[in-house]
């Protein structure tokens, strides 16, 4: 029986060009975490395997860094990074747990927004 729960950072926002840490935490179970997959929409970003360590998908190598812990750091954020992210915990003997995070990437600063709408 699956008794565990995934806690996530929930809905988060970050500035364009900056970085953000995606974090999930599995609690209320004694199951062993064998692997954690991180996905964005329909794409696999990275994997942390208990025996093998980290694997970052080649297309994200420049902008994704492993950790801290089982989390994932996204760097050089763009507006296109806005969307849903999923942590997928493969555990033994429980099975698979999933968590969802929604990231909104905002324009760099309020000042920048203000400048854009100034009347000449």
């Amino acid at each position: 029986m699956m008794t565990g729960t995934i806690e996530t950072t929930g809905n988060i926002s970050a500035e364009k060009g900056g970085s953000i840490i995606l974090q999930c935490h599995l609690s209320s179970t004694t199951a062993q975490v064998t692997q954690v997959n991180w996905e964005q929409q329909d794409q696999l970003l990275a994997i942390c395997n208990a025996d093998l360590g980290w694997h970052i998908s080649p297309s994200f190598k420049d902008r994704v860094a492993p950790g801290p812990g089982l989390g994932l750091t996204l760097q050089s954020l763009t507006v296109n990074d806005t969307g849903e992210y999923f942590c997928i915990y493969h555990t033994y003997p429980d099975g698979t747990y999933t968590g969802r995070i929604f990231l909104e990437v905002l324009e760099s600063s309020v000042a920048e927004h203000g400048a854009r709408f100034q009347i000449p």
Epitope: Q32, T34, Q35, N37, E39, D42, Q43, L44, I47, N49, D51, L52, H55, F86, I88, H90, Y92, P93, D94, G95, T96, T98
Partner: antibody, heavy 119, light 107 residues
Framework: EVQLVESGGDLVKPGGSLKLSCAAS????????MSWVRQTPDKRLEWVAT????????YYPDSVKGRFTISRDNAKNTLYLQMSSLKSEDTAMYYC????????????WGQGTSVTVSS | DIQMTQSPASLSVSVGETVTITCRAS??????LAWYQQKQGKSPQVLVY???NLADGVPSRFSGSRSGTQYSLKINSLQSEDFGSYYC?????????FGGGTKLEIK
């Protein structure tokens, strides 16, 4: 060159037991998860069992749980499948397969060993 | 348990044509899906892992894609050596399940 060679297949009566072996070579056996997959006479593929690289974790479908036991001897580079309380529906070609690192796909398969359960 | 529904069960096509085989999962299994090819009298061979990643040595005419719970294997410009059976397989909740298979035959 990666090689997986299965053996131990036979004709056995319903209720009987059989132990299959898979000899691995050409790779570091102790660092890979391994699986048994069978192909039924109607050509369907059925997953039978999986074991983690160190042997700590074993996985089975409900259809064989409690009847089949997967094990490994990393010192001998050998994978095993102990089958008991065999049924006619266990009749199949049994393949051992290696799992891709990080991904749960099976990247190398043996040639298979045939198991027939019939009275 | 998650069910994998593979379609079509069989397909009769000509060399040079493009075909798409699909597997639908009864729940979201994210990228935990692989595709295999099996030729008559041979063992299965992996084509695609993690839904979209081409295995080593697999020709680029093969491609895997995913949209939600639907997974597709596309073969562009079929060659004579591509005829055989194709299977999808998932890993989820500590279980591996194969689709029912698709038999690709020469028209």
């Amino acid at each position: 060159e990666v090689q997986l060679v299965e053996s131990g297949g036979d004709l056995v009566k319903p209720g009987g037991s059989l132990k299959l072996s898979c000899a691995a070579s050409g790779f570091t056996f102790s660092t890979y998860g391994m699986s048994w997959v069978r192909q039924t006479p109607d050509k369907r593929l059925e997953w039978v069992a999986t074991i983690s690289s160190g042997g700590s974790y074993t996985y089975y479908p409900d259809s064989v749980k409690g009847r089949f036991t997967i094990s490994r001897d990393n010192a001998k580079n050998t994978l095993y499948l102990q089958m008991s309380s065999l049924k006619s529906e266990d009749t199949a070609m049994y393949y051992c397969a290696r799992q891709v690192h990080y991904f749960y796909a099976m990247d190398y398969w043996g040639q298979g060993t045939s198991v027939t359960v019939s009275s | 348990d998650i069910q994998m529904t593979q379609s079509p069960a069989s397909l009769s096509v000509s060399v040079g044509e493009t075909v798409t085989i699909t597997c639908r999962a009864s729940e979201n299994i994210y990228s935990n899906l692989a595709w295999y090819q099996q030729k008559q009298g041979k063992s299965p061979q992996v084509l695609v892992y993690a839904a979209t990643n081409l295995a080593d040595g697999v020709p680029s005419r093969f491609s895997g894609s995913r949209s939600g719970t639907q997974y597709s294997l596309k073969i562009n410009s079929l060659q004579s050596e591509d005829f055989g059976s194709y299977y999808c397989q998932h890993f989820w909740d500590n279980a591996y399940t194969f689709g029912g298979g698709t038999k690709l035959e020469i028209k």
